[in-house]
Interface confidence: low
C-alpha cells in the first residue's frame, strides 16, 4: 500500500531508523489555490501540519513513551506544525468528519503512513507495529512502544498513535520517578489522613489531621 505523492526528502539516520527530513519549503509567493478554491496555507505552513491525533506522549507523567522515540516524534512534530491553515473538507466523504489540513494532492504522507525510500509512495504503517502521528516524509514508521513488565497498556498502538502505557494498579510514576513504577504507599504517616487514592501517576495524598487521629 502507498499514499499521497510527495517530494521524498533526503534520508537522514535518526537513532538507527531511517527517516526523511521534514523541512518547510516556504518561499516568497503564495501557495496555489486548494482544491476547494480557497487560498492555500501560508509559506511557512507549507510543510504540513499534524492532522491526526497526537500520540499520548507527555499527556501525563503516568504515561510512558521510550525517551528516544519521544525525542524523534517531538522533533517531527516541531518541524511539521509551524503554522495553521484553513481546513479543507473532503468532498463526498463516507468516513465521518475527518478533515484535511493539507491538499489531498499534497507533498507529505498522511498520518498512519510513511514515505517509501525506494518507490516514493506512501506506505501504510502496520497496525500494532508502527505509527506516525503527523503528516511526514519519514522513511519508516516509528515503532510502537512495548509496555514494560511493571506496566499495563492503557491504549493499544494504532497507525496514528503510539501505545499508551501506565503503571499497574498499586504502583505509580510521577515526575520524580519517570523511568520506573514505584509501589504506592500503604498508608499515611501518623498525624495525617489519606485524601486521595493512589493512581498510575501519583501516590496517595495525605494531609494533616487536625483532630490528631492518624492512619498507619
Amino acid at each position: 500500500a502507498s499514499g499521497t505523492e510527495a517530494a521524498t526528502a533526503t534520508p537522514s539516520k535518526v537513532w538507527g531508523s531511517s527517516a526523511g527530513r521534514i523541512e518547510p519549503r516556504g518561499g516568497g509567493r503564495g501557495a496555489l489555490p486548494t482544491s476547494m478554491g480557497q487560498q492555500g496555507p501560508s509559506a511557512q505552513a507549507r510543510a504540513g501540519r499534524v492532522v491526526g491525533p497526537r500520540s499520548a506522549q507527555g499527556a501525563s507523567p503516568g504515561l510512558r513513551v521510550h525517551k528516544t522515540l519521544k525525542f524523534v516524534v517531538v522533533g517531527v512534530l516541531l518541524q511539521v506544525v509551524p503554522g495553521s491553515a484553513a481546513t479543507i473538507k473532503v468532498h463526498d466523504q463516507s468516513v465521518g468528519t475527518q478533515q484535511w489540513e493539507h491538499s489531498p494532492l499534497g507533498e507529505l504522507c498522511p498520518p498512519g503512513s510513511h514515505r517509501s525510500e525506494h518507490s516514493g509512495a506512501c506506505n501504510q504503517c502496520t497496525e500494532g507495529v508502527g505509527y506516525t502521528s503527523a503528516s511526514n516524509n519519514l522513511f519508516s514508521c516509528l515503532p510502537c512502544t512495548a509496555c514494560k513488565s511493571d506496566e499495563e497498556e492503557r491504549s493499544a498502538c494504532t497507525r496514528t498513535r503510539n501505545t499508551a502505557c501506565q503503571c499497574k494498579p498499586g504502583t505509580f510514576r510521577n515526575d520524580d520517578s519517570a523511568e520506573m513504577c514505584r509501589k504506592c504507599s500503604t498508608g499515611c504517616p501518623r498525624g495525617k489522613v489519606k485524601v486521595k487514592d493512589c493512581t498510575p501517576w501519583s501516590d496517595i495524598e495525605c494531609v494533616h489531621n487536625e483532630s490528631g487521629n492518624g492512619h498507619n
Epitope: T4, E5, T34
Partner: antibody
Framework: EVQLVESGGGLVKPGGSLRLSCAAS????????MHWVRQAPGKGLEWVAG????????YYADSVKGRFTISRDNAKNSLYLQMNSLRAEDTAVYYC??????????????WGQGTLVTVSS | QPVLHQPPAMSSALGTTIRLTCTLR?????????VYWYQQRPGHPPRFLLR?????????GPQVPPRFSGSKDVARNRGYLSISELQPEDEAMYYC???????????FGSGTQLTVLS
C-alpha cells in the same frame, strides 16, 4: 503486467447519462488510488475525478462537481464514473489512470487506452 | 492567465538536446512543488516520464531512459524537461503537472508539441 481497460463510452444526447467502467488487472487494485482524466478532441489533458484506495475519499474537478460520481468495487477490480446531466463540452476521450500511491497524487503511472464519449444532439 | 504555462510547440534536430519549459504563474513558488512530466504520442494514452523536486529528490517512470531528465529554476519559477539524443519516437506532446497544494482543476499544463527534425 498492469492493464486498465475502459468501456461504456458512446454517443449520448445533452442532459443524458452514461456510466464508464475501467477493468483493472495485473496489480493489487485495492491498494491504489485511481483517477479519471479526459481529453477533448485536439485539446490537452483535464483531470476529472480521483478516488483513494478504499473508496472513502473522492475528489472532483469543479467542471464536473455535482454531475459526475466516481466509485470503485475492489472485489471486482473495477473503477466507475457515473456521468449525469451531460453537456457538449464533456465530449472527450476518458482515460482511467492508476495513481502511484494509495491516496491521490500527481503521479499517474499507468493509463488505459481511453473510451470516447460524444455528447451531441 | 493559467497557473501552468507551456509553449505550444518546440522543435529540434535528431540527436540534439532540447529543454522543454513549464512556467508556474509568478504568484506561486515553484520551490515548494514537485514538477511532473507526461509524454503523449499521437493516438496513444499519456505516459508518466518523471517527477523532479531537487537533484536529491526525483523519480523516473518505469522504462523511461535517462535521456529524459528534470530540473528546476526557482529564480525563474520554471520546471524543465531535458531530452538528450533526440530520437524520432520522441516526437510527441509533453505535459507538465505540479504536485503540492495545487488546485486539482489545474493539474496539467496546456502541453508542448515537440517536433523532431530529421
Amino acid at each position: 503486467e498492469v492493464q486498465l481497460v475502459e468501456s461504456g463510452g458512446g454517443l449520448v444526447k445533452p442532459g443524458g447519462s452514461l456510466r464508464l467502467s475501467c477493468a483493472a488487472s495485473g496489480f493489487t487494485f485495492s491498494t491504489y488510488g485511481m483517477h479519471w482524466v479526459r481529453q477533448a478532441p485536439g485539446k490537452g489533458l483535464e483531470w476529472v475525478a480521483g478516488i483513494n484506495y478504499s473508496g472513502n475519499n473522492k475528489y472532483y474537478a469543479d467542471s464536473v462537481k455535482g454531475r459526475f460520481t466516481i466509485s470503485r468495487d475492489n472485489a471486482k477490480n473495477s473503477l466507475y464514473l457515473q456521468m449525469n446531466s451531460l453537456r457538449a463540452e464533456d465530449t472527450a476521450v476518458y482515460y482511467c489512470a492508476r495513481d502511484h500511491s494509495t491516496w491521490l497524487s500527481r503521479h499517474l503511472d499507468y493509463w488505459g487506452q481511453g473510451t470516447l464519449v460524444t455528447v451531441s444532439s | 492567465q493559467p497557473v501552468l504555462h507551456q509553449p505550444p510547440a518546440m522543435s529540434s534536430a535528431l540527436g540534439t538536446t532540447i529543454r522543454l519549459t513549464c512556467t508556474l504563474r509568478n504568484d506561486h513558488d515553484i520551490g515548494v512543488y514537485s514538477v511532473y512530466w507526461y509524454q503523449q504520442r499521437p493516438g496513444h494514452p499519456p505516459r508518466f516520464l518523471l517527477r523532479y523536486f531537487s537533484q536529491s529528490d526525483k523519480s523516473q517512470g518505469p522504462q523511461v531512459p535517462p535521456r529524459f531528465s528534470g530540473s528546476k529554476d526557482v529564480a525563474r519559477n520554471r520546471g524543465y524537461l531535458s531530452i538528450s539524443e533526440l530520437q524520432p519516437e520522441d516526437e510527441a506532446m509533453y505535459y507538465c503537472a505540479m504536485g503540492a497544494r495545487s488546485s486539482v482543476t489545474h493539474v496539467f499544463g496546456s502541453g508542448t508539441q515537440l517536433t523532431v527534425l530529421s
